[in-house]
């Protein structure tokens, strides 16, 4: 079998074994077989063996074309069949790829999530490559000048430690493949200006039994950053807008934010801040059902979010997968 | 028509071994080519290994050779892929693939089965 090919001839791809997908493209096989005048010269692929397009150039070397070549990979031998030999022989094997040069990365982001010591860049790749593409992320500092490169093959983790040449920096990606290489826009941080505060997270739910019932929502966050502006939005499960109310917050302590909902609804909530005056968003927190009740009053703790429903103190249901509209965690 | 059930997946950590088995019923004379591809998510799914019936009879992708291992019990209808050495990189659903010469390519497909390679 061929698990290590040792080749009995040579086998080579037209324009090269890594090419652009949808090429034609031509597999080139030539036998250097002892006491062997090869009678006919066989190629597989994957290993079925190809019936069509070949050519057979002189006496030892043998042509293999194909239009429009659109695998992404294939594994490729081929064999001879030689006078005196019942088996066919074998001559030598190369996998070959097909894709695309890389695209130019953009929308560059670095954020630095608080407490997590590190600075997390990342990038819009552009279109599937197909073949193995890496990512070098430059960092300069724009005080020092000096440069630190990062290879990845998707995002990278900064440690904030190795920042050490100020607080301004310049950030570009640049994307290499077989194919091509693309350099993106340079990106300019200011290390106080991208952090994001530790995750909003609402704790609680309870509605109040009032003249106009009211919702009280409990929310806290770790963040020890001062200025923090927070969204929380909200709606029935049956619907698909949002409505979102906006907080100046101070995490000193348990917030509290109140609503006059609908009775006997069930409403899910999401909340993510910023630091204020600041570009980047928390993702949107966990969803957070409640049901209004009819008449009585209600409470709904985070720690009993699952789908029963009593009468009394009821409990509400938490599920990430079931809503439609949009739940994805948006930094920009 | 031809069915392939696949098993022996599972979760290995890296540097074990695991071996597939992909059994065929039906019209398993019309397949004179096993071969065993797998997708990881987000990829392409990949050539790992192929059994022929005649000419050379094994043949590897360059990614696997000298790691991997397929064979075939003809009485009993089934394909192995022994798989040793794994590497997180090895994690994809392994699914095998029936063809023939007279079709030029792999005419059946199994379900798969998951192989995970983590520690």
């Known amino acids: 079998g061929i698990t290590n090919i040792n080749c009995s001839g040579h086998i080579w791809v037209e324009p090269a074994t890594i090419f652009k997908m949808g090429m034609n493209i031509s597999i080139y096989c030539q036998a250097a077989i002892k006491n062997c005048q090869p009678r006919k010269l066989h190629f597989y692929k994957n290993g079925i063996k190809e019936r069509f397009q070949i050519t057979r150039i002189n006496k030892t070397t043998a042509r293999l074309w194909y239009k429009n070549f659109l695998e992404p990979h294939a594994s490729m031998y081929c064999t001879a069949e030689c006078p005196k030999h019942f088996q066919e022989t074998l001559i030598c094997g190369k996998d070959i790829s097909s894709g695309y040069p890389p695209d130019i990365p953009d929308e560059v982001t670095c954020v630095i999530y608080e407490y997590s010591g590190n600075m997390t860049c990342t990038w819009n790749a552009g279109k599937l490559t197909y073949i193995d593409t890496k990512y070098v992320v430059h960092v300069k500092s724009l005080e020092t000048e000096e440069e630190q490169q990062y290879l990845t093959s998707s995002y990278i983790n900064i440690s904030t430690d190795s920042l050490q040449g100020g607080k301004k920096y310049l950030v570009w990606v640049q994307a290499a493949n077989a194919l091509g290489m693309e350099e993106s826009k340079q990106l300019q941080i200011h290390l106080d200006d991208i952090v994001i505060p530790s995750a909003a997270v609402i704790s609680r739910a309870e509605t109040i039994n009032a003249t106009v019932p009211k919702t009280i929502i409990y929310w806290d966050s770790q963040t020890t950053i001062e200025k923090v502006s927070c969204e929380m939005r909200y709606k029935a499960t049956t619907n698909q807008t949002w409505n979102v109310k906006e907080f100046d917050t101070n995490f000193t302590y348990v917030q509290q934010s109140e609503f006059y909902l609908e009775p006997n609804i069930k409403y899910v909530f999401q909340v993510r801040c910023q630091e204020t005056g600041k570009r980047y968003w928390q993702p949107w927190s966990s969803l957070f059902f409640h049901k209004t009740p009819e008449t009585v009053p209600q409470v709904t703790s985070k720690a009993f979010q699952h789908d029963t429903w009593n009468s009394g103190l009821t409990v509400a249901s938490i599920s990430t997968g079931h809503l439609t509209s949009d739940n994805r965690g948006d930094i920009g | 028509e031809v069915q392939l059930v696949e098993s022996g997946g599972g979760l290995v950590q890296p540097g074990g071994s695991l071996t597939l088995s992909c059994v065929a019923s039906g019209r398993t004379f019309s397949t004179d080519v096993m071969g065993w591809f797998r997708q990881a998510p987000g990829k392409e799914r990949e050539f790992v290994a192929a059994?022929?019936?005649?000419?050379?009879?094994?043949v590897y992708a360059a990614s696997v050779k000298g790691r991997f291992t397929i064979s075939r019990d003809n009485a009993k209808n089934t394909v192995y892929l022994g798989m040793k050495s794994l590497k997180p990189e090895d994690t994809a659903v392994y699914v095998c693939?029936?063809?023939?010469?007279?079709?030029?390519?792999?005419?059946?497909w199994g379900q798969g089965t998951q192989v995970t390679v983590s520690s």
């Open positions: 693939a029936a063809g023939s010469d007279a079709s030029g390519g792999y005419d059946y």
């Open positions: 059994h022929r019936t005649s000419g050379i009879s094994t």
